[in-house]
Interface confidence: low
């Protein structure tokens, strides 16, 4: 049986080496000579030769200083053999424990720790945690028992001890009220970690604490009074720009301004926020009415996008807005008026009344009417009432002034405001047709060849509208039928064919042609016919003396 006492060896031992650790014994040494050897880590496996044993005495020795932080325990096996080399014992496991010395100082896990805390945070608020490690034995010794302390705080304002650190955990917390980002946005702490519960080896690191913004500053108007003016009736007009300052972090919800008009009951105004500089832009939400109110005294409050974190007074500004008078033009109702009237409407009679209204219901200004455009000079207007009458006969067939049976006149209404304002209305007279035009032939001048004359087509034209037009009736009168014949060229009788009954002499002839429309309105038209010295289809030939009733008359 083996006799092996517990083995421990301090690290970092001074020499001389080798140094006895313990004597190993086998009780078989009573029976004969026993020889000892060791195997295992530190003996015959790396690190080889750290431990040796005296072969005959069994003294286990260490040959060099140990480093617990490298190898904290060694496991060896002791062997005992007789002089003939036979084992007298089974191998025995030997555990060598390296005992710790405080040979390592704490090491922070980072050189610089970063943390943040909201301004105004109450004492006890956790900010961040710093961590250090120590390679020494923290189980059996205090060599790795780290204690944390704050060595310095920069700035030391508003108090030199704004933060505290938990000695054991390294958690940094707020210990004093008064954190204010706007005054001191960052703090730099030098923190220390020391072993032996703070009494031993030490090291330092830096903790940088950023104080984050809360909405603890209100936006403040500067100045608090403003003046502006705006013309009446115009919406979305910028009146003035409101200026605010806010000490909170720019371009954050705690800085961004929200403007509220406290006494805009009719929703006449709106304030929007300029996202770049936080200005308030006061505009009209709808057109203002000078006649109703010439001056507004607006009270505008400003807050932030997010609520105030603390009890703060809301800043207000006073804006005096003067409304400028604009004389509004009268408005014709409707802007375009259509009136149907017969083209034979009596001269001097009233056709219609066309009036305009003042845009402001309550301002009863006097309106005067006049005709601005009446190209045919057919109309006149009562300047006070807007009653429109004819001053001349209307004519639907006046194609210079009437388009598609419609005569367009422009009427203007002028008020007695200052300055005078004028509105325009369009009067459309839809002229209904009367049968005041008889049919006429087209063309009226016709050429025939003396030899083999080609019949000529004559169109019948009537400026009126159906039913005062086709079918037409044609008839040769005053003896013209002696030398000429006509026949209808189409079923609607809107054209006829004229041809001579016999060979005619070269010369000019006059033919009387009576044309009658569907309503029996007729008219006799003289056709001028030239017989030319030619054959077939005629061109234009020289003029000769006219011939009445289709007969040549001597000069």
């Amino acid at each position: 049986d083996w006799v092996i006492p517990p083995i421990s060896c301090p690290e970092n031992e001074k020499g001389p080496f080798p140094k006895n650790l313990v004597q190993i014994k086998s009780n078989k040494d009573k029976e004969g000579k026993v020889f000892y050897s060791i195997t295992g880590q530190g003996a015959d496996t790396p690190p080889v030769g750290v431990f040796i044993i005296e072969r005959e005495t069994g003294w286990l020795k260490v040959t060099e200083p140990l480093d617990r932080e490298r190898i904290a325990t060694y496991t060896l096996f002791s062997h005992a053999v007789s002089s003939n080399g036979n084992a007298v014992e089974d191998p025995m496991e030997i555990l060598i424990t390296v005992t710790d010395q405080n040979d390592n100082k704490p090491e922070f896990t980072q050189e610089v720790f970063k943390g943040s805390v909201m301004e105004g945070a109450l004492p006890g608020t956790s900010v961040m945690e710093v961590t250090a490690t120590d390679a020494d034995d923290d189980v059996n010794t205090y060599n790795a028992a780290i204690a944390y302390t704050i060595l310095s705080q920069d700035p030391e304002l508003p108090d030199k001890n704004m933060f505290t650190i938990n000695r054991n955990t390294g958690v940094i917390s707020v210990v004093t009220t008064g954190l204010d980002r706007e005054s001191f946005p960052t703090y730099t702490l030098v923190v220390q970690a020391a072993d032996l519960q703070g009494e031993g080896l030490s090291t330092t690191a830096t903790a940088v604490i950023t104080v984050t913004d809360t909405n603890d500053n209100p936006p403040i108007f500067n100045p608090t009074t403003y003046k502006g003016q705006v013309p009446e009736n115009e919406a979305n007009v910028v009146i003035t720009t409101l200026k605010v300052t806010d000490a909170d972090a720019p371009n954050t919800p705690a800085w961004e301004a929200v403007y509220t008009i406290l006494n805009d009951d009719g929703g006449q105004f709106v304030v929007t926020t300029n996202p770049v500089n936080n200005d308030g832009i006061l505009k009209t939400a709808k057109g203002l009415d000078f006649e109703a109110k010439q001056q507004y005294i607006l009270h505008v409050a400003v807050t932030n996008v997010v609520p105030f974190e603390v009890s703060l007074t809301t800043s207000t500004a006073t804006v005096t807005v003067d409304v400028l008078d604009v004389n509004e033009a009268p408005i014709f109702v409707p802007p375009e008026k259509r009136v149907e009237v017969s083209e034979d409407f009596g001269v001097g009679q009233e056709i219609t009344s066309y009036t305009a209204q003042e845009p402001d219901t309550f301002m009863e200004q006097k309106i005067t009417y006049r005709i601005w455009r009446d190209t045919a000079n057919w109309l006149e207007i009562n300047p006070d009432t807007g009653a429109i009458s004819t001053r001349a006969e209307l004519d639907r067939e006046d194609f210079e002034h009437v388009k598609n049976s419609t005569y367009t006149a422009l009427i203007i209404a002028t008020d007695n405001g200052s300055p005078v304002a004028t509105g325009t209305g369009t009067l459309l007279l839809i002229l209904s047709d009367v049968n005041d035009n008889a049919p006429i032939p087209e063309p009226r001048t016709i050429f025939f060849c003396e030899r083999n004359p080609k019949p000529q087509v004559i169109n019948i034209i009537d400026a009126d509208l159906p039913p005062n037009t086709s079918p037409f009736t044609a008839e040769l009168t005053h003896g013209a039928s002696a030398n000429w014949t006509i026949q209808y060229n189409d079923p609607t009788q809107e054209s006829i064919i004229l041809k001579p009954k016999m060979a005619l002499e070269v010369g000019d002839y006059k033919i009387n042609l009576k044309l009658m429309d569907n309503q029996n309105k007729d008219q006799v038209t003289t056709l001028e016919v030239s017989v030319c010295d030619c054959e077939g289809a005629a061109g234009v030939c020289r003029k000769a003396q006219p011939v009445e009733a289709g007969l040549q008359i001597p000069a």
Epitope: D265, G266, D289, A292, K293, Q295, T320, T361, F362
Partner: antibody, heavy 116, light 107 residues
Amino acid sequence: EVQLQQSGPELLKPGASVKISCKASGYTFTDYNMHWVKQSHGKSLEWIGNIYPYNGGTGYNQKFKTKATLTVDNSSSTAYMELRSLTSEDSAVYYCAIGNYWFAFWGQGTLVTVSA
Amino acid sequence: DIVMTQSQKFMSTSVGDRVSVTCKASQNVAINVAWYQQKPGQSPKALIYSASYRYSVVPDRFTGSGSGTDFTLPISNVQSEGLADYFCLQYINYPYTFGGGTKLEIK
């Protein structure tokens, strides 16, 4: 021609409610605020509140906030004022009047009498 | 609330005379004041708005003046139909408030 036609006189018992009407014509109903004004016998005028028919927005005199409720029916161009929990103090002539701020036209008035 | 004070409850005048009805505001109301005439048994009628602007169809015997806190309604060439109550109104801020009224009597 602008006209405001108010409903007829009312005789009511204490604790009752009444809804008086004001029918407008001759202008665009939604363009102007409709105001309501109280005139007690032999006394001055008191502004009750107004309603903007365009969006139904209202403004009240705090004194009448729990007494009066203003509504409109744009389809019939009619404004209404309901008075509740009537007492003898509510006996008065009530006028409707239009104008976005000052009152250009007034109704003929509705006499409300509260008597046990 | 803004208080509108018409210090004279009654005023007596003769036909053809000139008389001035006054109204004082408890704080600055700029020119946001209107004047109304109320004849016995009738609704009030607008005379003046924005302190000095005569309302349509109102005779030019009625004028208005003032701004800030002091306002006057001068009536010249008083006629017998001028027998009425005259009220001022401020409309700068809610609640709108009327003066207590001035009764004009014809001698």
